[in-house]
């Protein structure tokens, strides 16, 4: 009876999410493998988040709006492990917008989700950021490693969206 009611609850939650995400990929997790954590298909998952790589070339603001429509934000990178996971799925000859910007050009960098910007957990390429006119951040492959660079926000780039996993 308990299992039945849990299944019914899950089905109604799935129906609720289906209007936003036609397909979800879920895995069982938790102590008793009773919780399901899901990401929209074909997003990838890492820890408690889902990631989507958009190959559409758009400005930073348009890229953020595009993520927002999908219930996400441009990616906020919190750890080296998270960055290493994300970069496994990136093309080395491309650049991708991050959810990091400095709209006034005052070198006051801010994450789109209001996560505090911690200078100690940043992965700028050597010599970056280097221009107050370049107010948006990308991740790209340079000098044999992935890192961040400041670029013009209006210049179209690919992008990475991130959202919290859906738990049902």
């Amino acid at each position: 009876n308990f299992m039945y009611s849990k299944t019914v609850k899950r089905l109604s939650k799935l129906q609720e999410y289906q209007q936003y995400y036609p397909s979800l990929t879920c895995v069982m997790e938790g102590k008793d493998m009773e919780d399901w954590s899901c990401c929209p298909t074909p997003w990838t998952s890492f820890q408690s988040s889902c990631y989507f790589i958009s190959t559409v070339m758009q400005s930073w603001t348009k890229s953020q709006n595009n993520c927002s429509v999908m219930g996400a934000d441009l990616v906020v990178i919190n750890t080296k492990e998270e960055q290493d996971f994300i970069t496994q799925n990136l093309k080395i000859n491309s650049a991708y917008f991050l959810g990091l910007s400095d709209p006034k050009g005052w070198r006051h960098w801010q994450w789109v989700d209001q996560t505090p910007y911690n200078k100690n957990v940043t992965f700028w390429h050597s010599g970056e950021p280097n221009s107050p006119d370049e107010r948006c951040a990308i991740i790209n492959f340079r000098s044999e490693e992935w890192g961040w660079n400041d670029v013009h926000c209006h210049v179209p780039q690919k992008s990475i969206c991130k959202m919290k996993k859906i738990y049902i």
Partner: antibody, heavy 121, light 111 residues
Amino acid sequence: EVQLVESGGGLVKPGGSLRLSCAASGFTFSSYGMSWVRQAPGKGLEWVSTISSGDSYTYYPDSVKGRFTISRDNAKNSLYLQMNSLRAEDTAVYYCARQIYYDYAYYFDFWGQGTTVTVSS
Amino acid sequence: DIVMTQSPDSLAVSLGERATINCRASESVSFRTSHLMHWYQQKPGQPPKLLIYGASNLESGVPDRFSGSGSGTDFTLTISSLQAEDVAVYYCQQSIEDPPTFGGGTKVEIK
């Protein structure tokens, strides 16, 4: 006082080439992105190309891509537009304009007086 | 590309009266509190001159009878009390993404 002075316009036959120049003074040229904007006779404004302050980024509309090349020489405080394979529809006054960044984008705060390009056989 | 549509094409207003010019973008040119729309004035035989940036910020040296407003896709330039020297063509321009695009212009004349 900020000054932008364009030169190099003239009459050219279809298929011909011209190189426009813009001499900048009164500001630190190397710190600013620059653009060319044109205006066909009796028509509105059409952006033609952009170059970033450090020369790392150039951008063109489809109408001129592959035919026009924007460049700059920061040591000479000069902006250039090399125009090849010119067509009748390229006939216009060409303005050079300075870009000022504002939040996520930019606007044009100073414009030169323009130089006239006429493409006709 | 973002298409900018200005209305009206031309406008005749009596001296001292209010002139209002509208500009509509084919998609939003705002992001949060940033409105990436700008206005220029072009008098006959002269280059364009910046009037308003960021939808509502008056450029230095521009008379305060000029004002701008709007967000998203709809923006307005207002001349509160038209003067003879305001006879010109006015253009809006978006810069939220490349390519930057201009409206077709609105010609303001004295009635």
